[in-house]
Interface confidence: low
């Protein structure tokens, strides 16, 4: 089957009757009383453009109304990576809160107790703060009732928000409620909630709005309570989200609560240049976008984007540019091409373009003339067998046709020179150059088609086999579609390349496949009745997506819903139109193009490419099993268009593909299921300040070690080595925690021991901040400090001197055991008087 | 004109090897290549292989190979075949030609090897 | 290896008949086919190339056709500078191999 037919947002029209109510700018409370004035399941869907598909947001100025469902139209920006177990939630993978921490630079403090304010609402809040606080404010409406106060226990980062508990007799007699709940996470975060618990009386309001965060942007309406649904999952693309609800009385239902948790934004899709590429590595902030040209294009500009953290995290330039050149040369060419430059501009209506191509040394090329469209007057093509302008011409716009086997070059470079003076029509030049082995044909070349061959290195006795990409046939059509590189001697093909062409009519009987105007992507000539028959299985229907039309005044693109132009009419297409689907009510589509005589339009882009594919003809997407090791919520009982599932993981697993899947309006999943993955991985331990640590593997596997290691001066502070091992639940673990290097302090020495006294635990140095403590012999008293610290410093100190053991009165008549006593310690024998000696057998006076 | 003349006859003695040359001139000789073919006395062409005088890369007919070496000197325009461990069915006629990949429209006038005891 | 067969092995004519020349392959070659003369003691010298493209400086009465496996050099009035060996050659994969030869005689 072909690929999914994507859906697009603009596809997806408003429903007759609903409403769009427009973003107060003002203030916050003009948009909850015009929501709450607004309420209820008449609101349609957004005809945004909004790119996360996990979002329902409009941007800021556009008419707002919500959407019933999350949309999944393409894959989401920013994982999702909630698990609610039966026991509570936790968070898993990369926007679990640990991560959560503040950017460097930054301090945490801790989050304001449920009676201290936080910082304020609105525009004077700044987006500058990098701390995360969640708030919670009892906004007064004007009414005889005083509001009950809403009192919440929110956690930073993760957690619920639940709807007041009014148990206390005193509430139940006060009628009001009125909440803001506000949720503020770190810059370059977003909030993401689902719906755990949703019980709510009709005269009960729950609103969802993305704060506006930036000073002036008001807050914009996600979602309210009518098109809320347990299970259901909001983001917003802002690091504030503001949950609003109000009673008129004390609720009588369950009330509601509300997971919450931050996950980390990312920069949009950069945009592709035109005629070139973009890969990128990651949206997140650090990834990167890298730029490259089509052949026969340069690069202006940047060539590696990187995006940036912030609020709204940004790339860090501007999405360069491919520009064709006007000549130059290529050294060493291989496979290439050379494209005329656009019009005007930089290089004025007038060139004189020159290119020279070189091949290496016993190489000759092979030019293919892919696209030319030449003012016969204005424009002049030549090519020359050499690399000066002085080389034989083979090829001179001016005398000859456009050769359809191209031209090879005697010797190894060719020189071509195109000539442009304010040409009538525009000009058009693509040729495709390629360097070949003398002792072998040159690669054959088919634009809109595929070639496979029995030998890549295209010796003789090679054959070349012909193929057309969907939409596209042969010319000229049927066997034979192979080609054969003969003659060892002189290698060549034994017929010329064949041709891609979009042909006038056909049959299509694929499942899938594509429609394209005659001579797409050329402009299509005047004088065309053209008709196409499609026919997929008997118990199918046929999507029909226009994904280009541009067509004529005059001319039309007829859609007959059967077999043939006696048909019920689908539709009759005109003039520019945007893009729409129509599905056909059985396995049947006739197609008719009908473009009367008259002058032709030079240039590209008149024309039109239709994709069709064949669809059940039931209208619920197919039953999915449940991931192994996980679990999905569904937001319908009936897998209808629109459905939402949502994926989750147990407990050391992680989610491997897309977690939110939407049954698209083509009865098509938005994606393939994804599955649960145990985790096998520790999280990166991080690098330690003032150290360097070693990996035994890049991926931290279970099993794998982290050594650090301290930079000179510095000494380790706890664990050296780091082991990632495995838990039966949970994601595997450290061993240890991260250590520190503690900056070293030279050693106290030991100050030695006091006449008629001793030391603890004996030693030559005391590093920083260890004590020394004391002790005095029987009969002898402590005069001075029992315990010494040694203080750091360069030198480091002791606290005071060493004390002195002074003899006492009622002990002198025992002198003879002290005598005894002193000429065995071994501590009298060390130099400077210091021993090792630990007797405790002192008395404490 | 294109011009391929070749070096005087051999005479060698059966086990020795010879080497035999081929100049161009007339035409630019590091953008062809230089076969050569074999023909006994009163039989028809063998062909023994190729050398593109540019790369200097050879491809040789199976039955040769061991037998002729192929080599060029680009900067005097000469072609050389080496025969080696020589036998009586080596006593031909050996021609070289100049040619695309696939056929021979200019040839040298041919020198003659004779292998006797 | 592509076998060759040229007939017949000789042939007898007179000045301003016409005369054909026979080549056949032991496989299907298309037109990869290049024809040679041979004059007693010269060197060959192309006539046709790809079984029917002629070559500069060589007289408009030879002339080449076929392909697959059975190809004909025609010369349509016999003169007696013609009077030579004439060789097929293939080209369509290795090793090139030229056929044994078709001898020209005066009858």
């Known amino acids: 089957d072909g690929a999914p037919l994507p859906l697009k947002e603009e596809e997806i029209l408003p429903e007759p009757g609903s409403e769009t109510p427009t973003v107060a700018s003002e203030a916050l409370a003009e948009l909850l009383h015009g929501a709450l004035l607004r309420r209820g399941p008449e609101m349609g869907y957004l005809p945004g453009s909004d790119r996360d598909p996990t979002l329902a947001t409009p941007p800021a100025g556009q008419t707002l109304a919500v959407p019933s469902l999350p949309r999944a139209t393409e894959p989401g920006t920013g994982p999702l990576t909630t698990a609610v177990t039966p026991n509570g939630v936790r968070g898993a993978g990369p926007t679990a809160p640990e991560l959560l921490t503040p950017p460097p630079g930054t301090t945490a403090p801790p989050p304001p107790s449920p009676a201290s304010p936080g910082p304020p609402l609105g525009p004077e809040g700044g987006e500058e703060e990098t701390t995360t606080t969640i708030i919670t404010t009892t906004t007064v409406t004007t009414t005889v009732t005083s509001p009950v106060l809403c009192n919440n226990n929110i956690s930073e980062g993760e957690g619920y928000v639940e709807s007041p508990d009014l148990g206390s007799p005193v509430s139940r007699t006060l009628g009001l409620l009125d909440c803001t709940y506000s949720i503020h996470v770190y810059p370059g975060y977003g909030i993401e909630i689902q719906v755990q618990t949703l019980n709510l009386s009709q005269e009960e309001e729950l609103l969802v709005l993305a704060g506006g965060g930036s000073p002036g942007l008001a807050p914009r309406l996600l979602a309210n309570s009518s098109m809320l649904g347990e299970g259901q999952v909001l983001r917003s693309p802002t690091n504030r989200l503001l949950l609003h609800f109000q009673s008129p009385r004390v609720p009588r239902g369950g009330g509601f609560r509300i997971h919450y948790q931050a996950y980390l934004l990312s920069c949009g899709f950069p945009p592709r240049p035109a005629h070139g590429d973009v890969s990128v590595t990651d949206l997140h902030p650090g990834g990167t976008a890298t730029f490259h040209c089509d052949s026969g294009y340069q690069l202006q500009g940047e060539e590696t984007l990187i995006c940036l953290n912030g609020t709204r995290p940004s790339w860090n330039g501007e999405t360069p540019s491919c520009m064709a050149s006007c000549g130059g040369t290529i050294h060493n060419a291989t496979l290439g091409r050379i494209v005329s430059p656009e019009p005007g501009g930089a290089v004025g209506p007038n060139l004189t373009c020159r290119w020279v191509i070189e091949a290496a040394e016993g190489r000759r090329l092979h030019l293919h003339f892919e696209r030319v469209s030449l003012d016969e007057d204005n424009d002049r093509l030549m090519v020359r067998s050499g690399g000066s302008p002085l080389s034989p011409v083979i090829y001179d716009s001016d005398m000859d046709d456009v050769p359809e086997r191209g031209l090879i070059s005697d010797a190894q470079s060719l020189y071509v020179e195109l000539l442009s003076e304010t040409p009538a029509n525009p000009l058009l030049l693509s040729l495709r150059f390629e360097a070949f082995e003398e002792d072998r044909c040159f690669a054959p070349f088919l634009a809109h088609g595929n070639v496979t061959t029995t030998d890549p290195e295209y010796r003789p006795g090679a054959l070349a086999t012909f193929s057309c990409l969907p939409g596209y046939a042969l010319e000229p059509p049927g066997p034979p579609n192979a080609i054969e590189c003969v003659d060892p001697t002189e290698p060549h093909w034994n017929d010329t390349e064949p041709a891609c062409k979009a042909m006038c009519g056909g049959e299509l009987s694929e499942p899938a496949g594509v429609v394209l105007s005659p001579d797409w992507p050329q402009s299509y000539s005047p004088g065309q009745d053209c008709v196409w028959g499609v026919h997929v299985q008997e118990e199918k229907r046929i999507l029909l997506q226009v994904e280009i039309l541009n067509v004529r005044e005059g001319d039309m693109l007829t859609l007959f819903d059967g077999d043939g132009p006696s048909a019920r009419v689908l539709a009759q297409l005109r003039g520019p139109q945007p893009r729409r689907r129509l599905l056909s009510s059985g396995p049947d589509l006739t197609l008719q193009f009908q473009a009367p005589p008259g002058p032709p339009n030079p240039g590209l882009g008149q024309g039109f490419v239709l994709h069709f594919k064949e669809v059940p003809r039931n209208d619920t997407c197919p039953e999915l099993p449940p991931p192994e090791w996980g679990w999905r919520t569904a937001s319908h009982g009936d897998l209808i268009r629109g459905t939402v599932l949502t994926y989750q993981c147990e407990p050391g697993y992680e989610l491997l593909g897309s977690d939110i899947l939407t049954c698209q309006w083509d009865l098509s999943w938005s994606a393939a299921p994804p599955a649960c993955q145990k985790i096998m991985t520790c999280a990166d331990p991080g690098e330690i300040a003032n150290g360097h640590r070693t990996a035994s593997d890049a991926g931290f596997p279970v099993g794998s070690h982290v050594q650090y290691r301290c930079l000179p001066g510095y000494s380790l502070e706890g664990a050296a080595m780091l082991t990632c091992y495995s838990r039966d639940t949970g994601t595997p673990k450290w061993s240890d925690r991260v250590p520190k290097c503690a900056l070293k302090y030279e050693p106290c020495l030991n100050p030695g021991v006091p006449e008629n006294g001793y030391q603890t635990l004996y030693k030559h140095h005391y590093q920083a901040g260890e004590s020394l403590r004391f002790f005095c012999y029987e009969g002898f008293e402590l005069i001075g400090e029992v315990t010494i610290t040694c203080v750091p410093g360069h030198p480091s100190q002791w606290t005071s001197q060493p004390p002195l053991c002074k003899v006492a009165y009622e002990e002198l008549l025992d002198n003879r055991k002290l005598e005894v006593t002193q000429t065995t310690d071994p501590s009298r024998q060390l130099e400077g008087g210091l021993a090792g000696h630990h007797h405790h057998h002192h008395h404490h006076h | 004109q294109v011009h391929l003349p070749q070096s005087r006859p051999e005479l060698v003695k059966p086990g020795a090897s010879v080497k035999i040359s081929c100049k161009a001139s007339g035409y630019g000789f590091t953008r062809s290549y230089i076969h050569w073919v074999k023909q006994r006395p009163g039989q028809g062409l063998e062909w023994i292989g190729y050398?593109?005088?540019?790369?200097?890369?050879?491809t040789y007919n199976q039955k040769f190979k061991g037998k002729a070496s192929l080599t060029a000197d680009n900067p005097s325009s000469t072609a050389y075949m080496h025969l080696s461990s020589l036998t009586s069915e080596d006593s031909a006629i050996y021609f070289c030609a100049r040619g695309g990949v696939r056929y021979f429209d200019v040839w040298g006038a041919g020198t003659t090897v004779t292998v006797s005891s | 290896d592509i076998l060759l067969t040229q007939s017949p092995a000789i042939l007898s004519v007179s000045p301003g008949e016409g005369v054909s020349f026979s080549c056949r392959a032991s496989q299907s070659i298309g037109t990869s086919i290049h024809w040679y003369q041979q004059r007693t003691n010269g060197s060959p010298r192309l006539l046709i190339k790809?079984?029917?493209e002629s070559i500069s400086g060589i007289p408009s009465r030879f002339s080449g056709s076929g392909s697959g496996t059975d190809f004909t050099l025609r010369i349509n009035s016999l003169e007696s500078e013609d009077i030579a060996d004439y060789y097929c050659q293939q080209s369509n994969s290795w090793p090139l191999t030229f056929g044994a030869g078709t001898k020209l005689e005066l009858k």
């Open positions: 050398i593109s005088s540019g790369s200097g890369g050879t």
């Open positions: 790809y079984a029917s």
